[in-house]
Interface confidence: medium
């Protein structure tokens, strides 16, 4: 008997299990509904984030004015959902508001053309104009006393400014998570501005928030790229693998349900629907906590926290223990005579089940490796289920997995050995040289930023035991390489980068790893100005000084792509000695001018330029 006619039964089921987490009654006014669900404070914060992520160049005061207008309008709709315009969609309301900005054409150029379009095309148009690398000044941290005064004078404006500055620089930042960062930001100032040594208390906390924020932004950017460039199926596959590793005791139905809901949340946030996204994320956290027994034994502490902390905690929760005595995968996915029948009946369900079963058994694999295995399995079934003897054809499919598993294992082993030998800075330099030779057309700032982040994989992951290294390293590299892909997409200069970024999401890292030196590259003309340094380098922080040196290293490789490691090392050692010498000199500027010329000449000779 088929279950279809017994729909009424679902509503008798006491657990929320069978109800969609996001099933809602129809609301006359969407804006009133979200205002009531989220509360005024979160509503205003999320609208500010949304506007700042769309209009990244607008001054803070303009955004605050727009947000206040939207909030006042929302309140009228809460009072009377039938009031004029309250029935309009959020995209219509927000888009109309953005299009009232007087300087849209002068500030944003062709983005102003979006305002001539109707929804949903107008919102799509705004999304396409989000800039991953906006031309905005670097955020300079004021003195601690200045910050504390500003915090005490007007706490609300101070915190709004934080949301605004982060959101405009990170137009895909996960909005509900940014609320969590803002809460921690506020807590840091509340505590530290009363401390005896304000700076000692505050600065480490701000550094931690900055670093975590950058990482969070990059991770979310990959999720949005996955959804937007490769589609919902790709994101769902990623989510099945990750959630199955994290919740190996949960049954497939439960994982599938969480994947569906998580996909909705991220689709909304990546699409600029921040109010819906935050609301649905809260509902998902509530569902997970109400059904912990069916999901994971590790959720208890998370579920005792307030909403923002709870959602963050769930997203970062450690993997649950694997159930004991899981049967061999081969029985269902290789040895069974019903493999092709089961596959034909519901391909994505069967492949999802394969991915779930493989991932829950392999917390030691990266998500991208699991997805490569699932793709290999799918390709094999597509071929073999059309063959004369399917079983004979797919019988050895698991043997095809071996080289796929060994490739990242070997790569991580080699690179961790190199990292342990060199330390982080020199490991970054090795990667700078490696990647500049692979894709020398990419801009120097992008190569420096990406290679520095690639190099951080060493300190982040190599300390882990073998069983945790691959998921840490390869999934982190996926996030960093996505940064390269989105930055390169804005101004494409390398066919090789385009190819690796667009052909396969899960094979991006192997694609970049496989690139050799670009033999077609015509070396850059030598420009002495690129290697001219001034006394200001002496006052820079250690990190900024490293970036200066690494920028010079990239430029050297672009001038001389065939330079050996030894040649480059010699030049960089000379450069370090030159900076150290001149920063100790009485007349620093003269030293940089005179010694700099000698260094350039010596470098040219050493590299044969």
């Amino acid at each position: 008997m088929k279950w279809v006619t017994f729909i009424s039964l679902l509503f008798l089921f006491s657990s929320a299990y069978s109800r969609g987490v996001f099933r809602r009654d129809a609301h006359k006014s969407e804006v009133a509904h979200r205002f009531k669900d989220l509360g005024e404070e979160n509503f205003k914060a999320l609208v500010l984030i949304a506007f700042a992520q769309y209009l990244q160049q607008c001054p803070f005061e303009d955004h605050v004015k727009l947000v206040n207008e939207v909030t006042e309008f929302a309140k009228t709709c809460v009072a009377d959902e039938s009031a004029e315009n309250c029935d309009k969609s959020l995209h219509t309301l927000f888009g109309d508001k953005l299009c009232t900005v007087a300087t849209l054409r002068e500030t944003y150029g062709e983005m102003a053309d979006c305002c001539a379009k109707q929804e949903p095309e107008r919102n799509e148009c705004f999304l396409q104009h989000k800039d991953d690398n906006p031309n905005l000044p670097r955020l300079v941290r004021p003195e601690v006393d200045v910050m504390c005064t500003a915090f005490h004078d007007n706490e609300e404006t101070f915190l709004k400014k934080y949301l605004y500055e982060i959101a405009r620089r990170h137009p895909y930042f996960y909005a509900p998570e940014l609320l969590f960062f803002a809460k921690r930001y506020k807590a840091a100032f509340t505590e530290c501005c009363q401390a005896a040594d304000k700076a000692a208390c505050l600065l480490p906390k701000l550094d931690e928030l900055r670093d975590e924020g950058k990482a969070s932004s990059a991770k979310q950017r990959l999720k949005c790229a996955s959804l937007q460039k490769f589609g919902e199926r790709a994101f769902k596959a990623w989510a099945v693998a990750r959630l199955s590793q994290r919740f190996p005791k949960a049954e497939f139905a439960e994982v599938s349900k969480l994947v569906t809901d998580l996909t909705k949340v991220h689709t909304e946030c990546c699409h600029g629907d921040l109010l819906e996204c935050a609301d649905d994320r809260a509902d998902l956290a509530k569902y997970i906590c109400e059904n912990q027994d069916s999901i994971s034994s590790k959720l208890k502490e998370c579920c005792e926290k307030p909403l923002l902390e709870k959602s963050h905690c769930i997203a970062e929760v450690e993997n649950d223990e694997m159930p004991a005595d899981l049967p061999s995968l081969a029985a269902d996915f290789v040895e069974s005579k019903d493999v092709c029948k089961n596959y034909a009946e519901a391909k994505d369900v069967f492949l999802g089940m394969f991915l779930y079963e493989y991932a829950r058994r392999h917390p030691d694999y990266s998500v991208v490796l699991l997805l490569r295995l699932a793709k290999t399995y799918e390709t094999t079934l597509e071929k073999c289920c059309a063959a004369a003897d399917p079983h004979e054809c797919y019988a050895k499919v698991f043997d095809e997995f071996k080289p796929l598993v060994e490739e990242p294992q070997n790569l991580i082993k080699q690179n961790c050995e190199l990292f342990e030998q060199l330390g982080e800075y020199k490991f970054q330099n090795a990667l700078l040289v490696r990647y500049t030779k692979k894709v020398p057309q990419v801009s120097t700032p992008t190569l420096v930023e990406v290679s520095r982040n690639l190099g951080k994989v060493g300190s982040k992951c190599c300390k882990h035991p073998e069983a945790k290294r691959m998921p840490c390293a390869e999934d982190y590299l996926s996030v960093v390489l996505n940064q390269l892909c989105v930055l390169h997409e804005k101004t494409p200069v390398s066919d090789r980068v385009t190819k690796c970024c667009t052909e396969s999401l899960v094979n991006r890292r192997p694609c970049f790893s496989a690139l050799e030196v670009d033999e077609t590259y015509v070396p850059k003309e030598f420009n002495a100005e690129t290697f001219t340094f001034h006394a200001d380098i002496c006052t820079l922080s250690e990190k900024e000084r490293q970036i200066k040196k690494q920028t010079a290293l990239v430029e050297l490789v672009k001038h001389k792509p065939k330079a050996t490691k030894e040649q480059l090392k010699a030049v960089m050692d000379d450069f370090a000695a030159f900076v150290e010498k001149c920063c100790k000199a009485d007349d620093k500027e003269t030293c940089f001018a005179e010694e700099g010329k000698k260094l350039v000449a010596a470098s040219q000779a050493a590299l044969g330029l």
């Epitope: 069978s18 049954e251 069916s294």
Partner: nanobody, 118 residues
């Protein structure tokens, strides 16, 4: 083809016991949540109990808690419902059901009638 066979109903006296079994075929039994649903004469459908694929987590309707026990034997593709301290209000047709992705149920058996009467 998915099949769920649940023989073994019958007449039982109040306070008595009965064990229902359900043998599954046509799908990989150990991958799916299974459950029991019942329909009393002239009434709607009511959840009785369900169990996870690995047998580690179970749900019971308040009306049967402490009296009924659900279990499964994945090696035999069989689901069980042990019913103790039976009452007249437990009289119903009991269906064995297989779960689908969303946690709803997509297949169930023909049903077996359990009558509790003196």
């Amino acid at each position: 083809e998915v099949q769920l066979l649940e023989p073994g109903g019958g007449l039982v006296q109040p306070g008595g016991s009965l064990r229902l079994s359900c043998t599954a075929s046509g799908f990989t039994f150990r991958h799916y949540r299974m459950g029991w649903v019942r329909q009393a004469p002239g009434k709607g459908l009511e959840w009785v109990s369900w169990i996870r694929p690995d047998g580690t987590f179970t749900y019971y309707a308040d009306s049967v808690k402490g009296r009924f026990t659900i279990s499964r034997d994945n090696s035999k593709n069989t689901l069980y419902l042990q019913m103790n301290s039976l009452r007249a209000e437990d009289t119903a047709v009991y269906y064995c059901a297989k779960s689908y992705l969303s946690g709803t149920f997509d297949y169930w058996g023909q049903g077996t009638l359990v009558t509790v009467s003196s």
